[in-house]
């Protein structure tokens, strides 16, 4: 883990940020509120049965730039939004699932008769 002063590390916030957490609350959270040196996030993704599941919580500074970039993952419908502008800012984030592509149906397992 990088030390606070290392130049390669992302710029740390001067103060802790509080975020709402749901389905993603760490042990040190209280009353569904977590704290972080990074970002608050809200994420929507499909579960195994294709139903949308919303999770929210805290992302630490390390690696959060990458996690918040929301790079598309093949065969996985997922969207994440991040914020830092105020405490519990992720209460107001409402990511939506990317639309289904035709390919998603074709790329499934092929059953031979």
């Amino acid at each position: 883990k990088k030390e606070d002063g290392e130049s390669t590390a992302p710029t740390p916030r001067p103060k802790v940020l509080r975020c709402k957490c749901h389905h993603h609350c760490p042990e040190d959270s209280v009353n569904n509120i977590c704290s972080t040196d990074g970002y608050c996030f809200t994420m929507i993704e499909e579960d195994d049965s294709g139903l949308p599941v919303v999770t929210s919580g805290c992302l630490g500074l390390e690696g959060s730039d990458f996690q918040c970039r929301d790079t598309p993952i093949p065969h996985q419908r997922r969207s994440i939004e991040c914020c830092t502008e105020r405490n519990e800012c992720n209460k107001d984030l409402h990511p939506t699932l990317p639309p289904l592509k035709n390919r998603d149906f074709v790329d499934g397992p092929i059953h031979h008769r």
Epitope: K1, K15, V16, R18, D28, C34, S35, D37, E62, R86
Partner: antibody, heavy 116, light 112 residues
């Protein structure tokens, strides 16, 4: 340099309320949380709660939820703590303290005496 | 709540001696971000506490290098390599990992 100025003492009657102040200077007030801590002789330090001046978001120790109310006036870079329904148990030194991820600067403290 | 237990309560030392203060938490102080928010303060009579060490082992600006902090998880130590007269007072450990934030009961460093 960072300074947190608090009045030296307050004398209040039981049952009354008091509003303690903490004037910050030497840094950007909205860039840090402000915490309040209680110290009674022989009882150590107790965290009351904290407020983020940038959005007035507060977090309280459950023990003080009905006792303390934290507010800020960003135009004067001043934090306030109102204590209600005072009893002798509330007689103590109250510190304000700047908090980022840890407290790095403390006010000199206000000695609150609750007495008739 | 994370209960912070300090020992000893009183530590009589001779000037120039090494002093060691222990702080134990009832739960791990490793935050979900990976940081450990355990800090040390010195309070002299009639004064407010002053920050010495933050996040286990980082000396705050202006703090002499005779002060050092170590530990992990639940067990932490503050060491003063050569005690000077200005070091006398009450030392507190504090955690800001878990809400409510809590403090140790204090260790009084005094002259033997």
């Amino acid at each position: 340099q960072v300074q947190l100025q608090q009045p030296g003492a307050e004398l209040v009657k039981p049952g009354a309320s008091v509003k303690l102040s903490c004037k910050a200077s030497g840094y950007t007030f909205t860039n840090y949380w402000m915490q309040w801590v209680k110290q009674r002789p022989g009882q150590g330090l107790e965290w009351i709660g904290e407020i983020d001046p940038s959005d007035r978001y507060t977090l309280y120790n459950q023990k003080f939820k009905d006792k303390a109310t934290l507010t800020v006036d960003t135009s004067s870079s001043t934090a306030y703590m109102q204590l209600s329904s005072l009893t002798s148990e509330d007689s103590a030194v109250y510190y304000c303290a700047r908090f980022g991820y840890y407290v790095d600067y403390w006010g000199q403290g206000t000695t609150l005496t609750v007495s008739s | 709540d994370a209960v912070m237990t300090q020992s000893p309560l009183s530590l009589p030392v001779s000037l120039g001696d090494q002093a060691s203060i222990s702080c134990r938490s009832s739960q791990s102080l490793v935050h979900s971000t990976g940081n450990t928010y355990l800090h040390w303060y010195l309070q002299k009579p009639g004064q407010s506490p002053k920050l010495l060490i933050y996040k286990v082992s980082n000396r705050f600006s202006g703090v002499p290098d005779r002060f050092s902090g170590s530990g992990s998880g639940t067990d932490f130590t503050l060491k003063i390599s050569r005690v000077e007269a200005e070091d006398l007072g009450v030392y507190f450990c504090s955690q800001t990992t878990h809400v409510p934030f809590t403090f140790g009961s204090g260790t009084k460093l005094e002259i033997k």
